[in-house]
């Protein structure tokens, strides 16, 4: 059973993804952001469901194809380099799901924009937050 | 469907250049990121780099940083790879192929393959 | 750089057996993972992708499994068109690196 501990453990985790997937959000929605067209023709895949932390497997599988979407947008909308950025979220997403359990994700047929997808993960952490606390 | 055509078999000295070309037919270059992998001989498979052709960004593995220039133009759908300062062991087939975001979850892999270039390096 | 291991080098198998391919990754790499076949003076030709999904117009004898950063290609039934050499290959980080391929060949 989950100790009050690892709860706050990954309470803490999920408000860290949350606030890096809302800050790729912020810097893309950015009005100045010149790639925001093309961006918006990169097509992502949305899990058919996601109500637990194993199926952050469907986040991490597309994390590749967000790093290449946000290597087009000026590197002065984030913090940090994309490479970093994924590279921190990979790390936190692997916490929270675990690498033993090899879970395959599912996917919806109807594909997403980034706008759409990133939108769907803050969902999903919120959701998760809420009822951890 | 989608087509990459090379250009043809090249024979160079040791420490000459080689420009090899792949020209995308089916759908416009800009779609795709334009990769390339080579083979020596009887070896395996090597990355050198990809361009993204929309906007000219490159990325090169290390071993060939410095020698390598990837380039692509737009007008012909065509994507080039440049070697410079060539030894011996840089004879092997040279392939272009793609990776896209813009359609299917197969095409962010290698799913188009180039029939491959052979450069000879010897003197 | 992520080292993929491919087992064995050689495989010798006889049409109709069950053929198993390893490749093993040197860290985490999720489902990043895909399988080629090369045949001689050809081009390699894409099998699986995300560790799992057959590719398009792949005979469905051919599939893929993960176990942590073990990845398996096992073709069910060989057919005689499938002797050739296979490659893993990862995605999850530039550079991408091939493993350095099994042979299957006819006994």
């Known amino acids: 059973a989950p100790t009050s501990s690892s709860t706050k453990k990954t309470q803490l985790q999920l408000e860290h993804l949350l606030l890096d997937l809302q800050m790729i959000l912020n810097g893309i929605n950015n009005y100045k952001n010149p790639k925001l067209t093309r961006m918006l023709t990169f097509k992502f895949y949305m899990p058919k469901k996601a109500t637990e932390l194993k199926h952050l497997q469907c986040l991490e599988e597309e994390l590749g194809p967000l790093e290449e979407v946000l290597n087009l947008a000026q590197s002065k909308n984030f913090h940090l380099r994309p490479r970093d950025l994924i590279s921190n979220i990979r790390v936190i997403v692997l916490e929270l799901k675990g690498s033993e359990t090899t879970f395959m994700c599912e996917y919806a047929d109807e594909t997403a924009t980034i706008v759409e997808f990133l939108n769907r993960w803050i969902t999903f952490c919120q959701s998760i937050i809420s009822t951890l606390t | 469907q989608v087509q990459l055509v090379q250009s043809g078999a090249e024979v160079k000295k040791p420490g000459a250049t080689v420009k090899i070309s792949c020209k995308v037919s089916?759908?416009?270059?800009?779609?795709?990121?334009m990769h390339w992998v080579r083979q020596a001989p009887g070896q395996g498979l090597e990355w050198i780099g990809r361009i993204d052709p929309e906007d000219d960004s490159t990325k090169y593995a290390e071993n060939f940083k410095g020698r390598v220039t990837i380039t692509a133009d737009t007008s012909t759908d065509t994507a080039y790879m440049e070697l410079s300062s060539l030894r011996s062991e840089d004879t092997a087939v040279y392939y272009c192929?793609?990776?896209?975001?813009?359609?299917?979850?197969?095409?962010?892999?290698?799913?188009?393959w180039g029939q491959g270039t052979l450069v000879t390096v010897s003197s | 750089d992520i080292v993929l291991t491919q087992s064995p080098a050689t495989l010798s198998l006889s049409p109709g057996e069950r053929a198993t391919l390893s490749c093993q990754a040197s860290q985490y790499i999720s489902n990043y993972l895909s399988w080629y076949q090369q045949k001689p003076g050809q081009a390699p030709r894409l099998l699986i992708y995300?560790?799992?999904s057959l590719a398009s117009g792949i005979p469905a004898r051919f599939s893929g499994s993960r176990s942590g950063t073990d990845f398996t290609l096992t073709i069910s039934s060989l057919e005689p068109e499938d002797f050739a050499v296979y490659y893993c290959l990862q995605h999850y980080s530039t550079p991408y690196t091939f493993g350095q391929g099994t042979k299957l060949e006819i006994k």
């Open positions: 089916g759908d416009t270059i800009t779609a795709y990121y």
């Open positions: 192929t793609t990776v896209t975001f813009l359609y299917s979850r197969e095409l962010r892999w290698f799913a188009y």
């Open positions: 995300s560790a799992t």
